[in-house]
Interface confidence: low
């Protein structure tokens, strides 16, 4: 040990010797004598132990993505964006980190999730928890009344991933949010329709959205005899009735949150319902519910959804479920989250949900918190859950075993003999310059066979191959790679026939 | 095991400096910050600041700021704080402590050192 | 600074009976505030982590110890006391750079 400290030494007055050499300038000679001093006490010293116990790896919680892991993500990010812009949507992105003040006070329970920074400038700082509360203070600081937006990006969570299986500490999130004043549940109601174009164009399978409102939650708990300061802690309990049954979340609630068995009882009676616009009707007829004035608003704001999105199309995939209820804090009309649906075993059985895939509300505070005069702008808005999307489009495609194409490379500029290395250079410089996506293997004097090979393990469709004769008769062998059809095509014409041939507009405009 | 080991008991003069050593084991020294704490006989605590070995950044008690310096040398894993300018206010144990978190701001302190007695006195 | 107010001074509690003792930060604007750990320190001894986080119990604590509360006022609670609580409590936050600790409360035995 105390031989490597003094060997550890050495090597370090050398390198100290060398620095100087240079910075005087020394001559060439001298300092190349000094390095190999120094490259030899290096090679005595051998490997830093404490160098070989670093275990290489990305930190808790993150994950890096292959290339075909990122060309499925492109695929799924290209259906929502090309959604969120059908829709009308701007696209607006914010900092990574925020300040800490700005995220304090907005999540509830959660805030002990996110991520502090250190910062030598003396502000205190967090990364961001989603892209929502970013937004509400964008638009607060900016002074806007009136956006559609939409935002992907990723976000931070302090999350125990090893113990939430498929929970990342860093993730994407894909927001959509409409800010405005408007007529009451029209832009709520584009908010459904925008999800349900997704899941549908995703072809992910079967879902269902279930939609609630956060009065009519608050109504309900108030009826049955809950205190204010039960209000949200009750609501995450009853917010497990999708994974669990209504007797475990009644002992939760009676047990460990101290409510009184009768209070929970008449709980049950409610949340366990679940049904279309015919249990809104119901419960405006209630004698309890149809009392209280927050339950009664919310009730008919959702018959008024309802209506809407029967002209969208999409009441089908909707369901009006007591029992959702969402656990940020900053929720305050229509919550809503889409489930995706297992087989039932058995027909004549309900559809089983399998988690969330997308999920939002309405959050009419927000914006408030960060106007010094309390201002609101009334807003609402969506969130993919693309993550777990992700998941499910790599597991469907391995189990298809489909092979994902991680590049777009149209075709593979060859040559079928040596020494045209110049010739493949110029043309693949060509189709370059005319937009097309053309790659060349870094060889003098590729083998065809390896050229071929190389296309069939990319994916690339066309090989444009040059030879001798080709290069005296001013054409081009293109060669189709899954059919090895081949055909001599003009120079010229090219870049036309590439394009016609892989479905590219023949402009690039 | 996680331990935190401090250098022996100190007498000074008013005037001088002194410089504590916390020396850790049982975890990776640079994953953690190790922050200085002190109590005056019969007194409550206080914080002074920590260092974060890992870059080396330090967050300050603007009270200690410039009497107070924290450095840390990674290759012994042990953690140093020096007070300069001593008063016979600064008689205290001091201890040294590491940050329950490896994030930012909001440590609590899971492990102590067992505490360096400074006594300032002419 | 933020000001830890800790109350009682000091508490004389019968074995088996419960002790609570309270803790109050001052300019601490937010109710989801819950940065507060709390520190049991028997005579000759350094502090000894308790609670973190308002509510978590740090590993190896008998559960006999709690904290709740938010915002600024939190609660250390010991269920039923033992003759081996008999220590000097502290409460500490650590919201914004300088983490502050209160006063302590003495904690007796009746």
């Known amino acids: 040990m105390a031989e490597r400290a003094a060997l550890e030494e050495l090597v370090k007055l050398q390198g100290e010797r060398v620095r100087g050499l240079k910075q005087q300038k020394a001559s060439a000679e001298l300092i190349e004598e000094e390095v190999a001093k120094l490259l030899k006490l290096k090679a005595q010293l051998g490997p830093d132990e404490s160098k070989q116990k670093f275990v290489l790896k990305t930190p808790k919680g993150t994950r890096d993505y292959s290339p075909r892991q990122m060309a499925v993500r492109e695929k799924v990010f290209d259906v929502i964006i090309r959604c969120f812009k059908r829709h009308g949507a701007e696209v607006i992105d914010t900092p990574v980190f925020e300040l800490k003040e700005t995220l304090m006070g907005k999540y509830g329970e959660d805030s002990k999730l996110i991520y502090d920074l250190k910062d030598q400038g003396g502000e205190l700082l967090s990364l961001r928890y989603d892209l929502t509360v970013p937004f509400a203070r964008y638009l607060a600081m900016n002074k806007l009344t009136n956006i559609k937006r939409y935002h992907i990006a990723k976000v931070y969570r302090r999350d125990n991933p090893a113990m939430t299986r498929g929970r990342y500490r860093e993730f994407y999130q894909c927001d959509f949010d409409i800010a405005g004043n408007f007529d009451p549940m029209i832009p709520d109601a584009e908010c459904l329709k925008i999800m349900c174009e997704i899941l549908s164009s995703l072809q992910i399978g079967d879902f269902l959205v279930k939609v609630n409102d956060r009065r009519i939650l608050d109504g309900m708990f108030a009826i049955c005899g809950v205190s204010d300061s039960k209000f949200r802690t009750i609501c995450s309990s009853v917010d497990k009735l999708d994974k669990v049954s209504w007797e475990e979340v009644k002992n939760e609630m009676v047990g460990e949150k101290g409510l009184a068995p009768e209070v929970a009882d008449r709980i049950g009676d409610y949340v366990q319902q679940h049904g279309g616009v015919s249990l809104v009707e119901q419960l405006l007829q209630d004698p309890k519910l149809s009392q209280n004035k927050q339950a009664l608003e919310g009730l008919g704001d959702l018959k008024l959804l309802f209506e809407y999105l029967t002209l969208f199309g999409i009441d089908d995939k909707i369901s009006f479920d007591l029992s959702l209820a969402r656990g940020l804090d900053y929720y305050t009309g229509v919550i809503y989250e889409a489930v995706l649906l297992q087989t039932p075993a058995q027909a004549g059985e309900e559809p089983l949900g399998v988690g969330s895939v997308a999920a939002g509300g309405r959050y009419d505070g927000l914006v408030g918190m960060f106007d010094p005069k309390g201002r609101k702008v009334p807003c609402v808005g969506l969130s993919i859950g693309v993550e777990r999307i992700f998941s499910i489009v790599e597991q469907r495609l391995e189990a298809l075993e489909e092979k994902i194409r991680t590049t777009e490379t149209q075709v593979l500029v060859a040559s079928a003999q040596k020494k045209l290395l110049e010739e493949r250079l110029k043309l693949v410089s060509e189709l370059w310059d005319a937009g097309i996506k053309a790659e060349l293997l870094y060889k003098k004097n590729p083998k065809l066979l390896n050229q071929l090979q190389y296309c069939e393990e990319a994916g690339i469709p066309l090989v444009a191959i040059i030879g001798e004769q080709e290069l005296k008769d001013g054409v081009i062998k293109l060669r189709s790679v899954t059919s090895r059809e081949e055909v001599d095509v003009r120079r010229e014409d090219l870049v036309e026939e590439i394009k016609r041939r892989t479905g590219q507009p023949l402009c690039i405009c | 095991q996680v331990q935190l080991v401090q250098s022996g008991a100190e007498v000074k003069k008013p005037g001088a400096s002194v410089k504590v050593s916390c020396k850790a084991s049982g975890y990776t020294f640079t994953d953690y910050c190790i922050g200085w704490i002190r109590q005056a006989p019969g007194q409550g605590l206080e914080w002074m600041g920590d260092?974060?070995?890992?870059?080396?950044?330090?967050n300050d008690n603007e009270k200690f700021k410039d009497r107070a310096t924290m450095t840390a040398d990674t290759s012994t894993s042990t953690a140093y704080m020096e007070l300069s300018s001593l008063r016979s206010e600064d008689t205290a144990v001091y201890y040294c402590?590491?940050?329950?978190?490896?994030?930012?701001?909001?440590?609590?302190?899971?492990?102590w050192g067992q505490g360096t007695s400074v006594t300032v006195s002419s | 600074d933020i000001v830890m107010t800790q109350s009682p001074d000091s508490l004389a509690v019968s074995l088996g009976e419960r002790a609570t003792i309270n803790c109050q930060s001052q300019s601490v604007s937010t109710s989801t505030y819950n940065y507060m750990h709390w520190y049991q320190q028997k005579p000759g001894q350094p502090p000894k982590l308790l609670i973190k986080y308002a509510s978590n119990l740090e590993s190896g604590v008998p559960d006999r110890f709690s904290g709740s509360g938010s915002g600024t006022d939190f609660t250390l609670t010991i269920s039923s006391l033992q003759a081996e609580d008999v220590a000097t409590y502290y409460c500490q936050h650590s919201w914004e750079i300088p983490w502050t600790f209160g006063g302590g409360t003495k904690l007796e035995i009746k």
């Open positions: 260092i974060c070995p890992g870059d080396a950044y330090t």
């Open positions: 402590a590491r940050g329950e978190e490896q994030l930012g701001l909001r440590n609590a302190m899971d492990y």
